[in-house]
Interface confidence: medium
């Protein structure tokens, strides 16, 4: 399932709430085709969360996932 702020493969706005770090399974960058640069976090429930890559909380969550999953961003 997609979060309400995720439209297909792109983000039109950023999630403004707290990022549930402990419930994140992976993250990826949206493509250059998208209106906004964004990092999308995917939760254990399969929900997608659009996030601002410049936000300190987002960077912290990415670092957490990088430590947890050594593969880093799951992009081809």
């Amino acid at each position: 399932a997609r979060g309400t702020n995720v439209g297909r493969e792109c983000c039109l706005e950023y999630f403004k709430g707290a990022i549930p770090i402990s419930r994140l399974t992976r993250w990826y960058k949206t493509s250059g085709e998208c209106p906004k640069d964004a990092i999308v976090f995917v939760t254990v429930q399969g929900k997608s969360i659009c996030s601002d890559p410049k936000d300190k909380r987002v960077k912290k969550a990415v670092r957490y996932l990088q430590r947890t999953w050594k593969g880093g961003p799951q992009e081809s």
């Epitope: 493969e9 792109c10 990826y28 493509s31 250059g32 085709e33 209106p35 961003p73 992009e75």
Partner: antibody, heavy 122, light 111 residues
Framework: QVTLKESGPGILQPSQTLSLTCSFS??????????VGWIRQPSGKGLEWLAH???????RYNPALKSRLTISKDTFNNQVFLNIASVDTADTATYYC??????????????WGQGTLVTVSA | DIVMTQATSSVFVTPGDSVSISCRSS???????????LYWFLQRPGQSPQLLIY???NLASGVPDRFSGSGSGTAFTLRISRVEAEDVGVYYC????????FGAGTKLELK
């Protein structure tokens, strides 16, 4: 019916600022997911993306030209503007504007203007 | 920047025949979401470019199904079956995984 039309000075001298206008109809930059981009093409050569602007005023620039480019919009009058500072003869080209839409059919540059030829000459 | 290479500058085709035009990228255009961010445009003589294919294999609105796109992450092909006179022009590939960059173009001419 979506249409775009570019206008510019035609000829200008080196070191001047090039001001381009894209006037469009058939869509609105008030619409979420809508954008307009600029692409140029020197005579007999290939295409180069310059910049684009989104409905929410988010702007993107070609990194190689970023310091010289300024893109802006007038949503009410359905116009997008591009300024290129300190032009040189290498900026001689046909300049196109094109529509971008993130929506039911996400496709970049699906609609183009006819282009406007700009010559930089001393 | 991702570099797009169209190694063949021109191709000559007999009307009614098929032709393939190739393009390569310096980096894989396959995203983790499954999309491949490769576009094809046709610029007919004296005209503006026209979108043919987006995301490697999707036909743009109003484009005849004689055109088709395929490829892998870095190697792409535009195929035109039953070439017609109106297909003459320059074909450009464009990547959009990152900021858009175009190939140098391949000119299609009739024999």
């Amino acid at each position: 019916q979506v249409t775009l039309k570019e206008s510019g000075p035609g000829i200008l001298q080196p070191s001047q600022t090039l001001s381009l206008t894209c006037s469009f109809s058939g869509f609105s930059l008030n619409t979420s997911g809508m954008g307009v981009g600029w692409i140029r093409q020197p005579s007999g050569k290939g295409l180069e993306w310059l910049a684009h602007i989104w409905w929410d005023d988010d702007k993107r620039y070609n990194p190689a030209l970023k310091s010289r480019l300024t893109i802006s919009k007038d949503t009410f009058n359905n116009q997008v503007f591009l300024n290129i500072a300190s032009v040189d003869t290498a900026d001689t080209a046909t300049y196109y504007c094109a529509r971008i839409y993130f929506g039911s059919s996400l496709a970049w540059f699906a609609y183009w203007g006819q282009g406007t030829l700009v010559t930089v000459s001393a | 920047d991702i570099v797009m290479t169209q190694a063949t500058s021109s191709v000559f085709v007999t009307p009614g025949d098929s032709v393939s035009i190739s393009c390569r990228s310096s980096k894989s255009l396959l995203h983790s979401n499954g999309n491949t961010y490769l576009y094809w445009f046709l610029q007919r003589p004296g005209q503006s470019p026209q979108l043919l294919i987006y995301r490697m294999s999707n036909l743009a609105s109003g484009v005849p199904d004689r055109f088709s796109g395929s490829g892998s992450g870095t190697a792409f092909t535009l195929r035109i079956s039953r070439v017609e006179a109106e297909d003459v022009g320059v074909y450009y590939c464009m990547q959009h995984l990152e900021n858009p960059t175009f190939g140098a173009g391949t000119k299609l001419e009739l024999k």
